[in-house]
């Protein structure tokens, strides 16, 4: 057959979804790779075909849209399972074409099993929010185009394996669930199971995101340098080994970038000749702040290095500061055999 | 009314095991609480023994209480210490605390159950 | 492991007295710190939390101060129900959890 752009397997489009429950998957070609919708597409007499790859399996085959009850269905861009099941997972591509043009992309798609708890290898989205800040909500994700807005679902949400009910600072208000004020004790899994009838028929959507409680807004400070500071003095003599440690402190920020950086002279350890080594390390609370230790090393320091300024540098989205090291040359102890008895004298 | 009530202490003999219970009233586990067992030796300081989500189960102890002291839930409002191979030097008041990974408004302890370990 | 340093460890003080209590992580820990207060016979009691934060019904005169590793309680004026003995507790993460040895506060 003729040439067809193929964009090949989209593996960033990793489509995971539960065995036995309805799924609705868009062609990936008109949300990523093309400048022109499906009806736009129709219009211009362009055929959109479905097929797969099973699992574990080298051949592409037609989808089979004549099972019972239209399991399988197409409707526009959309290929719908009504339900899924566990040997739906595999490879399946749509490919866009007329005599003259054509166009295709593969995706993933796997059908998962959850236990009664709801566990299971699903990739989970995570949802923060801030601590004691207020009323915040989390709506029940992806469950847009599966039902008419005639029709009312019921909707139970979870914590984990326990029905929320009665929960002291958690409402389920419908396809949302509002925190009256969010604590550490409401980190966790929720899911929300939707059940909507269909031509007789019912069926459940089941929705599970991760709850990260986070540092508030109203908590955040620019970085906070607790080392180096006027308290502690590097004193160091030629040839020993100079450690000094730069330990950060930063509050969460949403989508913030933290940075820690030394200069030595004004310059980046980088662009200068003497042999520094920086190693970091990075630890998080239990509400997301970070604190950054980035400690610079001389194994063997001169006396030159001792003249040196080093001031530790931080950013974050709240602002930039600075802290210098105090760092000296150690006055040798007096040699008491020469020097002390010179003092006396002796030659 | 929001309480912890801690059970099960006594006298032990070394070598011998304990379980110590506490009760939760005013609220139950299926919030995602963190409750933890504290002892405190006679005349001596607060010592974090084991602790656990009640939502999620995860549990987290101090490393000398793990391979000796286990910590557990019921589904509802009872936690529990099971405590093994007791030493002397296990001789103490155990509380029954919540929330102490962010103690603010929620932190809450009970008034704690004395366990001594003698021949 | 975290280590949770209290000084004094015990300090005797009279009525009215400005009473300091100070805490020193091993690493740092940011604001999270916790101070409690503890009578005989009796379960520790939050009085402050998120190192400045006032736990609910504790009196104005017990204050807290301090980030990164140096953090210290103040009592601005001792009342004769503040004779007791005082804890810190670092909850910065799991690795992190720990309690001082405690300060005694008793009457000079």
């Known amino acids: 057959s003729e040439r067809c752009d193929d964009w090949g397997l989209d593996t960033m489009r990793q489509i995971q979804v539960f065995e036995d429950e309805p799924a609705r998957i868009k062609c990936p070609l008109f949300e990523h790779f093309l400048k022109f919708n499906y009806s736009t597409a129709h219009s211009a007499g362009l055929t959109l075909i479905w097929y797969w790859t099973r699992q574990d399996r080298d051949l592409e085959e037609p989808i089979n849209f004549r099972l019972p009850e239209n399991r399988i269905s197409k409707e526009k861009d959309v290929l719908w399972f009504r339900p899924t099941l566990l040997n739906d997972t595999g490879n399946y591509t749509c490919m866009l074409r007329n005599t003259t043009y054509c166009s295709k992309v593969a995706f993933p798609l796997e059908v998962v099993q959850k236990d009664s708890c709801f566990n299971s290898p699903m990739k989970l989205p995570v949802h923060k929010l801030y601590i004691e800040y207020g009323i915040q909500r989390i709506t029940c994700p992806n469950v847009d185009g599966y039902f008419p807005s005639s029709v009312k679902p019921t909707i139970t949400w979870y914590m984990g394996c326990y029905k929320i009910q009665n929960f002291n600072n958690v409402i389920p208000e419908g396809m949302n669930l509002s925190f009256l004020i969010a604590l550490i004790s409401n980190n966790g899994n929720y899911t929300c199971v939707v059940t909507y009838p269909e031509n007789g028929r019912t069926f459940h959507l089941t929705r599970t995101l991760t709850v990260k409680v986070v540092g508030s807004p109203k908590n955040a400070v620019p970085p906070v340098i607790h080392s180096p500071n006027d308290h502690v003095v590097y004193e160091k003599e030629p040839g020993e080994e100079l450690l000094i440690p730069c330990t950060v402190y930063f509050s969460f920020l949403m989508d913030s970038r933290n940075e820690v950086w030394w200069t030595i002279d004004g310059k980046k350890p980088d662009d200068i000749t003497i042999d520094v080594t920086i190693n970091e390390s990075i630890s998080h609370s239990r509400t997301e702040d970070e604190t950054r230790t980035q400690i610079l090393s001389i194994k063997k320091v001169t006396s030159e290095d001792l003249k040196r300024s080093y001031v530790c540098h931080a950013r974050s989205a709240k602002g930039e500061v600075a802290k210098a090291a105090k760092v000296k040359q150690k006055v040798p102890a007096p040699r008491y055999t020469v020097e002390l008895a010179c003092g006396f004298g002796a030659t | 009314q929001v309480q912890l009530v801690e059970s099960g202490g006594g006298l032990v003999q070394p070598g011998g095991s304990l379980r110590l219970s506490c009760a939760a009233s005013?609220?139950?586990?299926?919030?995602?609480?963190?409750m933890c067992w504290v002892r405190q030796a006679p005349g001596k300081g607060l010592e974090l023994v084991a602790c656990?989500?009640?939502?999620?189960?995860?549990t987290w102890s101090a490393s000398w209480a793990k391979g000796r002291f286990t910590i557990s839930k019921t589904n509802s409002t009872t936690l529990y210490l099971q405590m093994n191979s007791l030493r002397a030097e296990d001789t103490a008041v155990y509380f029954c605390?919540?929330?102490?990974?962010?103690?603010?408004?929620?932190?809450?302890w009970g008034q704690g159950t004395l366990v001594t370990v003698s021949s | 492991d975290i280590q949770m340093t209290q000084s004094p460890s015990s300090l005797s003080a009279s009525v009215g007295d400005r009473v300091t209590i100070t805490c020193q992580a091993s690493?740092?820990?940011?604001?999270?710190l916790a101070w409690y207060q503890q009578k005989p016979g009796q379960a520790p009691k939050l009085l402050i939390y998120?190192?400045?934060t006032l736990a609910s019904g504790v009196p104005s005169r017990f204050s807290g101060s301090g980030s990164g590793t140096d953090f210290t309680l103040t009592i601005s004026s001792l009342q004769p129900e503040d004779f007791a003995t005082y804890y810190c507790q670092s909850y910065y993460n799991s690795d992190s959890d720990a309690f001082g040895q405690g300060t005694k506060v008793v009457i000079k």
């Open positions: 656990i989500y009640t939502n999620s189960g995860n």
């Open positions: 690493q740092s820990i940011g604001y999270y």
């Open positions: 998120r190192a400045s």
């Open positions: 605390a919540r929330d102490l990974n962010y103690p603010d408004t929620s932190n809450l």
């Open positions: 005013g609220f139950d586990f299926s919030s995602n609480y963190y």
